[in-house]
């Protein structure tokens, strides 16, 4: 009987939280073991059975007495209105074409949640609804009182709705935004009484798909897959995310424990190709990303191990290491980097199966180095391993350069006192720790006479008292391995302090630019000598060696200070290694105004004149070259005398100024004065920068014409 293939035992249950109706039914009259395709037409009505709001055809394969299920999600919260459901069925199977017509409808199954609500005068639905931003949401209130006027507010803004029936009003919210993690607040309240109800609508940010999905293996046994989860949903507890890895070739699936990575055991059956789907899922939606790759192309080797630096000499060292195997036939490409003073100074690539070895050449003796190695799959490069690093220090070698030596010669009681200075060798020249310096004195008048002095480091000089003979002095630096080449300097019986005219030089920001005349005859080089702390007993003697073809140099130093006079001496070095003085230069890196004024004496006072005189004072101590003097004269006279001009002082007083532009002049006669008149004078030197400090004026009164009678 065809009509008997009808849906029976229809049950409807509800899931308020998800706003779902769940239908359960079965078809009883199928023959045993019979399996037919059927289609079920489902109708859902709201409030009245005549108001059908949903019709859907659901197709499935049916067995005898099998429980069939179908769910429907309502846009309207189920508490807002009564819903009714009915269905009918039809066979839709090629096996029985004659049965293709609808069965009778089932009776309407009524779902009325309102009847189970409490006795409160007002209810608002849905409760704790969770949606993604941009969704449309339907809200309603159910009122138990016809008299009360109910107003509903979304975040304090009144909403306008449609009345479903006298007790129910519905509000349609379009494109809801994410506001805050605690959700969106909706309140409904009655005009009369103190009835108020609130609900929270949880709006999450859109669930994004995972980014940067990638898988790799370090040992061909485990794949480590990583990804960046999409941005935070913006809600605290409502939206937990789950991540699932599915591999299509093996058909295996794993639920990931962590939200940004997952491990996958590699199949022992030598599966090479992997096709992963990573599915991120939350309550609201699923997002999937795919990745297809060959396992051997995704090898990220482990860091090299058993790394040693062996056979370390002064200039060579050998690095050895082992690599973790990544399969029987694979070759690893290893990269070696050598660091010196924090910079890469050598880089090399080496192919390795199991053991690696690399010789590092052209190293500096007694130097700290760091060597590091990392490896990658040579056949299919994916990623480098981590570096494994080793520090080592090369062995010492004999110093490679002669010390830079200079001397100062003084004649004391018929003896020659020679102070020797040398600069410490640079790290590069010393090739190890300098332990001592050897000074060998060779008397040129008695060549077989040698004297050896051994001076422990870190001394940078020594004092020798020699007789008037000529000597050649050899200085070497010594470390644990050997001796440096010798530096040779000669001292003749004549101290060689001939008189040389001193020339002025002007310093700049860059230093002092010194030049000299080239020397006729053979010179092996030049030396420029100066003190960095002139006036200080220790002086801090400095020198600069220059080649035989050099006739100028710039001397610069951070120690140069404004207002300090620096004296430079330029020596030629003869072929016999004897220094001789060529030129003297003196100057300031920056001149300043004079620091003080000379003491002035007045003499020869007459009715019409007086004479001023002042002592010469140490030019060395002046903060600039004195170019002359300014004499200021104050008097009652309105006009300035010949040879002077009007000047305004710092206190705005007016006086007359005489300019004395000869710095060697030490007397000055003030003439053309008036008898029995009061005058005041003040003398100050000036440099290229300006005058000295303004001091106190000295008072003087000329006698009257007849005072001598």
């Amino acid at each position: 009987e065809p009509l008997s293939l009808a849906p029976e035992s229809l049950e409807v249950s509800i899931d308020s939280a998800r706003q779902c109706l769940h239908l359960k039914w079965s078809v009883h009259n199928l023959a045993y073991h019979q399996e037919l395709k059927m289609v079920f037409q489902i109708e859902i009505s709201r409030i009245k059975t005549s108001n059908v709001i949903w019709v859907e055809n659901y197709s499935t394969t049916v067995k005898r007495n099998q429980v069939l299920r179908w769910s429907w999600e309502s846009k309207l919260p189920l508490e807002c209105a009564k819903h009714s459901v009915r269905m009918r069925g039809a066979v839709d199977d090629a096996q029985v074409p004659e049965l293709r017509f609808w069965s009778n409808w089932t009776s309407w199954e009524e779902v009325d949640v309102q009847s189970s609500l409490g006795h409160d005068p007002l209810f608002v639905f849905p409760k704790d609804k969770l949606v993604e931003e941009g969704s449309n949401v339907t809200i309603c209130y159910v009122s138990r009182s016809h008299q009360n006027n109910i107003s509903c507010y979304l975040e304090g803004v009144r909403m306008h709705g449609e009345q479903l029936d006298p007790n129910v009003c519905v509000f349609h919210l379009k494109n809801v935004p994410f506001i805050r993690e605690t959700g969106t607040n909706i309140y409904c309240k009655a005009d009369q009484g103190d009835v108020i109800k609130g609900i929270v609508l949880f709006v999450s940010k859109v669930f994004e798909e995972p980014k940067d999905f990638s898988c790799e293996t370090r040992d061909l046994k485990t794949l480590n897959c990583t990804w960046a989860p999409g941005s935070d949903a913006g809600l605290l507890t409502q939206l937990s995310q789950s991540y699932t890895l599915f591999e299509s070739f093996s058909g295996k699936k794993t639920l990931c424990k962590y939200k940004s990575w997952c491990n996958w055991q590699v199949s022992p059956d030598s599966q090479e190709m992997y096709n992963f789907t990573l599915t991120a899922e939350n309550y609201l939606r699923k997002r999937s990303v795919h990745l297809l790759f060959n396992l051997t192309h995704r090898v990220h080797p482990m860091a090299p191990f058993n790394v040693f630096v062996k056979n370390v000499s002064a200039t060579n060292a050998t690095m050895t290491w082992k690599v973790h195997s990544i399969g029987n036939y694979s070759t690893l490409l290893c990269q070696i980097e050598l660091y010196g003073e924090g910079k890469v100074i050598q880089k090399q690539n080496v192919s390795v199966k199991v053991n690696g070895k690399h010789l590092m050449k052209k190293l500096e003796p007694s130097t700290e180095y760091a060597a590091q190695v990392r490896c990658a799959n040579a056949n299919h490069f994916w990623k480098w391993s981590e570096w494994t690093r080793r520090n080592f220090t090369t062995a010492e070698a004999a110093p490679s350069e002669a010390p830079d030596v200079w001397r100062n010669v003084k004649s004391v009681q018929g003896h020659c006192v020679v102070t020797l200075f040398w600069k410490p060798l640079s790290k590069l020249q010393a090739n190890g720790k300098i332990l001592f310096y050897n000074v060998v004195l060779e008397n040129l008048d008695r060549p077989s006479t040698l004297k050896l002095l051994s001076i422990p480091a870190p001394a940078n000089g020594t004092e020798l008292t020699l007789d008037r003979c000529s000597y050649q002095i050899h200085v070497t630096a010594n470390n644990s391995v050997g001796t440096s080449p010798a530096s040779v300097i000669a001292v003749s019986g004549d101290p060689g302090n001939k008189e040389v005219e001193e020339e002025r030089v002007k310093g700049t920001e860059d230093g002092f630019c010194l030049s000299w005349k080239p020397q006729p005859g053979d010179v092996t080089g030049y030396v420029v000598e100066w003190c960095e702390r002139p006036g200080d007993p220790l002086c801090d003697l400095q020198w600069k060696n220059l080649g035989p073809n050099t006739t100028s140099t710039v001397v610069s130093s951070d120690a140069f200070r404004p207002g300090v006079r620096y004296n430079f001496r330029i020596y030629g070095i003869s072929t016999e290694r004897i220094p001789y003085l060529l030129e003297k230069k003196t100057g300031y890196s920056q001149e300043l105004v004079p620091s003080d004024n000379p003491q002035v004496l007045m003499s020869n006072l007459t009715s019409y004149s007086f004479t001023l005189s002042w002592k010469d004072y140490a030019a060395e101590s002046q903060p600039g070259f004195v170019q002359g003097y300014s004499l200021y004269l104050k008097s009652k006279a309105a006009r300035c005398l010949p040879g002077s001009e009007k000047a305004v002082l710092s206190d705005d007083s007016i006086c007359c100024k005489y300019k004395i532009d000869n710095p060697k002049q030490k007397t000055f006669v003030v003439e053309n004065l008036q008898p029995a008149s009061f005058y005041e004078f003040f003398l100050t030197p000036y440099t290229s920068v300006g005058e000295g400090p303004q001091g106190a004026f000295t008072k003087v009164t000329t006698p009257d014409e007849y005072s001598h009678i």
Epitope: E181, N185, T237
Partner: antibody, heavy 117, light 107 residues
Framework: DVQLVESGGDLVKPGGSLRLTCVAS????????MAWVRQAPGKGLQWVAN????????YYLDSLKSRFTISRDNAKNTLYLQMNSLKTEDTATYYC??????????WGQGTLVTVSS | EIQMTQSPSSLSASPGDRVTITCKAS??????VAWYQQKPGKVPKLLIY???TRHTGVPSRFSGSGSGTDFTLTISSLEPEDAATYYC?????????FGQGTKVEIK
Amino acid sequence: DVQLVESGGDLVKPGGSLRLTCVASGFTYSDYYMAWVRQAPGKGLQWVANINYDGSSTYYLDSLKSRFTISRDNAKNTLYLQMNSLKTEDTATYYCVRGLTWDFDVWGQGTLVTVSS
Amino acid sequence: EIQMTQSPSSLSASPGDRVTITCKASQDVDTAVAWYQQKPGKVPKLLIYLASTRHTGVPSRFSGSGSGTDFTLTISSLEPEDAATYYCQQYSRFPLTFGQGTKVEIK
């Protein structure tokens, strides 16, 4: 008449446990968020925990999460706060409160919890 | 956590005075702010929610305003029965937090 009545407050030693109970009446209990708020003697208000309508979501002050548990029994119109490993700084009056949403429109009279050795 | 800072911490005013209490949030809380009144020896009572909505039964002299980080509770004409401590509360982010309170005394 809408009412919340707390009980269970007591003097307890540090490290001890207490269970606070709140019985609701005069409204449909399952239709509201509920919470606990505390007030130390002479001090201000401090939110402790919240629970949603059916107890499926709970929210806590981070520093109390490991020691306090909020729960509800809608059939009995009752709210609970289980407090373990109590510390002297937990001494306060504990209020059972009803939430409109996250704002609190009905407050119980409070129950005093004293933690002292 | 979001800090809610109330000022002043206490004030004294005469009946009929206009009283303003401010609450500053350490970060944007939109309008998710409530105000409570607690009279001495009594339990707190909700006055305002969503920053400016007066709760049912609250006298119209109480009003709330503000959004973002700055909020104000105003009593337009102080009554003797308004002597109490007033608290603001934010419910924009967890944990929910209260201000430290402002004590209002009547001269």
